[in-house]
């Protein structure tokens, strides 16, 4: 029995396994919600602080089935997308389409992914082969990075990859702390 | 330093049940799985089940259902396992071992040192 | 599910040969997701080799892993003594996740 008959009414990305690309900025899927997230008191003149967490911005959850080939995951997965830009904490909206969208006239604020987190998938394959284990990152938070004049779009792709990048002198979270050889690999998976 | 300490030997009569620890330290407790591993006596390692802390999320091996119960409590960083109905083929060492969080691969990097349980009359 | 065969399940060898174990699985397995442990007498194992071919932190260079499909297997350039042990393959590319039965290494 094919995939064809499985109805999906969610947000359907489907990456290679291990690889995530960056979500569009919009989403339209009756699942989506709204938070503002990190907020803050804001500040008087807004960019007269380099504190990021003054600023705040939009989580919105999606649902989406992974596939792996012919195969489809059990049930869908719930993950954030980070979107859009950030505004002080007060002038977010708290839901969609309330209130205006407050956008900048200085350097940018881009919605970024902070944190991630693993979850695994139980891939259901037709042909009665056996369901497989499979991992996948979602995001678990998002945060506002500030990006002057000089940062471009390219930059702004790595953010997600950046974020998930272990920093001397603090652990990141998620990580892993195994292995040599590919030891790169695993300690940089997030 | 990753840590995961277990409680300690368990001596249980038949048909009772028996609930051991494992308490983890030196990482985020809730960014990765937690599996469970049982070894008998001189024998080979069974894939128990494993647990997200995130999100409480359990799977288990189709043997041990109904035998085996994993809960995690986040506020301590402990994971449990209740095994129930106890007879002396569970008799084993029984281990916790962190998964590591990269995507590409399942593997186990940290092992508790083991919870040795004895069923007896 | 998927069975994993060892072997040999025993085997011996002196400081500084070159041995060579093997894993067989009963249907192909993704080769990211086969592990080697470690397991030494009265103690737990360790995550040895990872992906079928990454050692893990602090395993010596002399251990390599190779493998694809049903047939992976676990190498030691030049065994030394620290190297007996039991161990064991894993898949955890199907559910359940399963091991192998080990092979066990005796150094003469």
């Known amino acids: 029995q094919g995939w064809q008959a499985f109805k999906n009414d969610a947000t359907e990305i489907i990456p290679e396994l291990g690889e995530y690309p960056e979500p569009p900025p919009e989403l339209e899927n009756n699942k989506t919600m709204n938070r503002a997230e990190n907020g803050g008191r804001p500040p008087h003149h807004p960019f007269e602080t380099k504190d990021v967490s003054e600023y705040s911005c939009r989580e919105l959850h999606f649902t989406r089935y992974v596939t792996d080939g012919p195969c489809r995951s059990a049930k869908p997965v719930t993950e954030l997308v980070c979107s859009g830009q950030c505004g002080p904490a007060r002038l977010l909206p708290n839901a969609i389409g309330r209130g205006k969208w407050w956008r900048p006239s200085g350097p940018d604020f881009r919605c970024i992914p902070d944190r991630y987190r693993a979850q695994r998938v139980q891939l259901l394959c037709p042909g009665g082969e056996a369901p497989r284990a499979r991992k996948v990152r979602l995001v678990a938070s998002c945060k506002c990075k500030r990006l002057t004049r000089f940062h471009n779009q390219s930059e702004l792709k790595d953010f997600g990859t950046e974020a998930a990048r272990p920093q001397k002198g603090r652990k990141p979270r998620p990580r892993a702390r195994s292995a040599k050889a590919n030891q790169a690999e695993l300690e940089n998976a997030y | 330093e990753v840590q995961l300490q277990q409680s300690g030997p368990e001596l249980v009569k038949p048909g009772a049940s028996v609930k051991m620890s494992c308490k983890a330290s030196g990482y985020t407790f809730t960014d990765y799985y937690m599996n469970w591993v049982k070894q008998s006596h001189g024998e080979s390692l069974e894939w128990i089940g494993d647990?997200?802390?995130?999100?409480?999320?359990?799977t288990y091996n189709h043997k041990f259902k109904g035998k085996a119960t994993l809960t995690v409590d986040k506020s301590s960083n402990t994971a449990y396992m209740q095994l129930n109905s106890l007879t002396s083929e569970d008799s084993a060492v029984y281990y916790c071992?962190?998964?590591?969080?990269?995507?590409?691969?399942?593997?186990?990097?940290?092992w508790g040192q083991g919870t040795s349980v004895t069923v007896s009359s | 599910q998927i069975v994993l065969t060892q072997s040999p399940a025993i085997m011996s060898a002196s400081p500084g040969e070159k041995v060579t174990m093997t894993c067989r699985a009963s249907?192909?397995?993704?080769?990211?997701?086969l592990n080697w442990y470690q397991q030494k007498p009265g103690s737990s194992p360790k995550l040895w080799i990872y992906?079928?071919?990454n050692l893990a932190s602090g395993v010596p260079a002399r251990f390599s892993g190779s493998g694809s499909g049903t047939s992976y297997s676990l190498t030691i350039s030049s065994v030394e003594a620290e190297d007996a042990a039991t161990y064991y393959c894993q898949q955890y590319d199907f559910f359940p996740s399963t091991f192998g039965g080990g092979t066990k290494l005796e150094i003469k």
């Open positions: 992906s079928t071919s």
């Open positions: 071992a962190r998964e590591t969080a990269v995507i590409t691969t399942n593997a186990m990097d940290y």
């Open positions: 647990i997200n802390p995130y999100n409480d999320d359990t």
């Open positions: 249907s192909s397995v993704t080769s990211s997701y």
